[in-house]
Amino acid sequence: EKPVYELQVQKSVTVQEGLCVLVPCSFSYPWRSWYSSPPLYVYWFRDGEIPYYAEVVATNNPDRRVKPETQGRFRLLGDVQKKNCSLSIGDARMEDTGSYFFRVERGRDVKYSYQQNKLNLEVTALIEKPDIHFLEPLESGRPTRLSCSLPGSCEAGPPLTFSWTGNALSPLDPETTRSSELTLTPRPEDHGTNLTCQMKRQGAQVTTERTVQLNVSYAPQTITIFRNGIALEILQNTSYLPVLEGQALRLLCDAPSNPPAHLSWFQGSPALNATPISNTGILELRRVRSAEEGGFTCRAQHPLGFLQIFLNLSVYSLPQLLGPSCSWEAEGLHCRCSFRARPAPSLCWRLEEKPLEGNSSQGSFKVNSSSAGPWANSSLILHGGLSSDLKVSCKAWNIYGSQSGSVLLLQGRSNLGTGVVPAAL
């Protein structure tokens, strides 16, 4: 058999600074099994070095000196007896860039440098970023383990140092943030914030970092109801809104959460399976009615829980007045005034702009009030005839406004015809 020296190794390999690379390699050399069996030694040298004197970059020969700058970083991987010359390069440095050749030695007969198959190593600037691993989604209040690792890095070389930064880490002690792993208990306010892992090789200038935006899943913590862009005050899960009867109303309910909660509006205080009157955070009423005193509920439904706020509508109305109207009856002149308002209004009668309060001590007039449904009625009885033309007014008022009406009573009962007083409003 013809003696053959062969080496199979890639011509060039590129690795980023601080990372590792494995260069597969196999070789063959002439060897007869009936020869004596001296040990097989293999070496990797820097190109241009003289094998007899030079320090090697990697070898399996314990008696050969290894270059201090590659010690522990360049290693032979695999079984050389099986003709495996694979080279592992760790914590690559810029100064490692260059050509390397492989040499085999066994006894006196086998001493060969494979100069035709050199390995060209190029170390480039580090652009690889670390990976931050954690189980998604992050859930508010649930501790989660995060780890930071650099693809392509290995144990070779000085140890890596880590530092974590981000708003979500504020309560952690500094030691915790210097490990490749940390346990984070995210809060709702951490959603959307940045978390950065920075890696550095001790004693080297090589640093790299990765920033991730935290996606924290959290149930709604609060509900806000807006009217015309203004938030309503909420006390004990209830909001109070005074609103004018007959007015159109558009309300917006907002409940920050992630993923967004499903918002809906219900009549009154609903059961859990009630039918919504709006399947969004928007409630539109073409007008508010007195019947709306029952109020509405905004519910925010979320996979992590639900929240609801009751909106208590306090419906108010300005006094609406019917009257006064007057007629002659047996006991004297009888005037009536009807009014409707929320809250219930006060009412007073005036005769020639002079207030008539209660019942007169002389018995010249009498006031009676009653209410039925939304309407209240008041009556004024004036005893005796009219000495001159008189103006009778009634006025209703509440905290939101007032309304008044008046009639002009013309002198002389005979003028009144069918008994209805001619009115000049």
């Epitope: 919504p276 709006s278 399947n279 969004t280 009423l285 073409r286 009615r289 007195s290 019947a291």
Partner: antibody, heavy 122, light 113 residues
Amino acid sequence: QAYLQQSGPELVKPGASVKVSCKASGYSFTDYNIYWVKQSHGKSLEWIGYFDPYNGGTNYNQRFKDKATLTVDKSSSTAFMQLNSLTSEDSAVYYCAREGYGYDDREWFAYWGQGTLVTVSA
Amino acid sequence: DIVMTQSPSSLAASVGEKVTMSCKSSQSLLYSTNQMTYLAWYQQKPGQSPKLLIFWASTRESGVPDRFTGSGSGTDFTLTISSVKAEDLAVYYCHQFYSYPFTFGSGTRWEIK
């Protein structure tokens, strides 16, 4: 419980007018729109229009704009529909109906009157 | 105007059977502001006024038996009677109240087989 009571059947001559009434009870009359619907014999339903007793607002189906006039009398909680220039095509059952919740300008018909049969015949 | 197309125009089924009827609208009845579907179903028994069964496409009116179910969204809707009873003999109408003029389907008549 809301209840709508309509006036009785009418037999009218072509060219004449008729006024159908619908008396509401069991709820606050001004809080809900009253709708009117036509159903010709053996046919489907046709929306005529609505009257809003709160503010007097109306909305008509264009097909009935010149045929129907909607009014109400708030004091008696009664809605009216007057049909004019009647022809045989107007022979039908006419229903009044009340909307559901009264929140929206567009709602379903939750309560129906019993219907008034108007027959136009010479 | 929105056109409401109901099918079939009539169907025959035995008491106890499941009955399904369809209603298609010529445009979507989903109102984006409140994400509610503006469709109702009515039942009209012979000689009677229509009666509300379903509103907002799937909300059963109070007092309506739970054998009546409304479903669908957008433009395609279905009324299902899970186990039809003799008293359900009627014409069923779908109704869009999404935009004026309000319109009704031509009806589906259920007859006993």
